[in-house]
């Protein structure tokens, strides 16, 4: 049996788009869609959109949740509408995260 | 300090296979994408593929898609790539290379390993 | 597959002077683009990511530019250590595609 290699799933969907970086778009096609809180010089900065570029969801979905930010991503259309990321309860240790750049 | 130490020169068959190493430090790579990439002697760089260590799933060039295999070990934080059905088309160095959200891009890359093959 | 075409293929110049190479995709890539240098006998070194920005470590001296299909390089007073060849990734699109190459040597 020849051994097939498993291929990228590399659906488009269409996904919720709410943030500054949406611009005056409210949805946005990508391969991935996410819901993020971020904390931002004090502010809960709640941002929704799409990942483009399938390594770049890769990376930053699998990125754990740190005190100062979350995201939770899911491949479906308008799947994000639902999400609301959420940071870590106190007392739970995490490792650190990097922040990631949306386009 | 984050290193990715491959393994050595291979002078290999027409024919054969060959399994090449990449020994992450500093890091672990399941919090990575680790890339193989491919240079012939003067030419310039061809992107073969990734794994996400964490999950083991795989995405290649389709140049490559017949020809290499890539697969990583976590709990020796190490990447493998193989090659098989080698040809005189396959000497090169081969280097392997993380992708972080860092950079999102490849931003640690290992020595090379040089692949000859000769009959 | 999406085309990196890098020009020019080699380029001379001497200490002190400035450089720029250019990278055109085959169709838009947004900024994920990357910029490498490579040494003979050695790896490739990032030192530019998402078109602009500068890698950790890399001097001030080196910078990118661009967007869409359009990027560019440049090194500014040149150093010794910087003859070397270069080369443009994009990141957009599997397969990852790199530019030939730009090998710039001493004048």
């Known amino acids: 049996v020849e051994d097939e290699k498993p291929k990228v799933n590399q659906k488009l969907y269409m996904c919720v788009c709410e943030g500054l970086s949406c611009g005056n778009e409210d949805h946005c096609e990508g391969q991935q869609c996410f819901s993020s809180l971020s904390i931002n010089d004090g502010f809960h900065v709640y941002q929704k959109g799409c990942f483009q570029v399938y390594e770049q969801g890769k990376m930053t979905c699998k990125t754990p949740p740190s005190p100062g930010q979350a995201v939770e991503c899911c491949q479906g259309d308008w799947c994000n509408r639902n999400i609301t990321a959420q940071l870590p309860t106190k007392g739970k240790s995490f490792p650190g995260t990097q922040n990631f750049h949306l386009e | 300090e984050v290193q990715l130490q491959q393994s050595g020169a291979e002078l290999v068959r027409p024919g054969a296979s060959v399994r090449l190493s990449c020994t992450a430090s500093?890091?672990?790579?399941?919090?990575?994408?680790m890339h193989w990439v491919k240079q012939r002697p003067e030419q310039g760089l061809e992107w073969i593929g990734w794994i996400d260590p964490e999950d083991g799933e795989t995405k290649y060039a389709p140049n490559f898609q017949d020809k290499a295999t890539i697969t990583a070990v976590t709990s020796s934080n190490t990447a493998y790539l193989q090659l098989s059905s080698l040809t005189s088309e396959d000497s090169a160095i081969y280097y392997c290379a993380r992708y972080t959200s860092d950079y999102y891009t490849m931003d640690y890359w290992g020595q090379g390993t040089s692949v000859t093959v000769s009959s | 597959d999406i085309q990196m075409t890098q020009s020019p293929a080699s380029q001379s110049a001497s200490l002190g002077e400035s450089v720029t190479f250019t990278c055109l995709a085959s169709?838009?890539?947004?900024?994920?683009l990357a910029w490498y240098q490579q040494k003979p006998g050695k790896s490739p070194q990032l030192l530019i990511y998402?078109?602009?920005s500068l890698a950790d470590g890399v001097p001030s001296r080196f910078s990118g530019s661009g967007s869409g299909t359009k990027f560019s390089f440049k090194i500014s007073s040149l150093q010794a250590e910087d003859f070397a060849s270069y080369y443009c990734q994009q990141l957009y699109s599997t397969p990852w595609t790199f530019g030939g190459g730009t090998k710039l040597e001493i004048k």
């Open positions: 998402a078109a602009t």
């Open positions: 169709q838009t890539i947004g900024t994920w």
């Open positions: 500093g890091f672990n790579i399941k919090d990575s994408l």
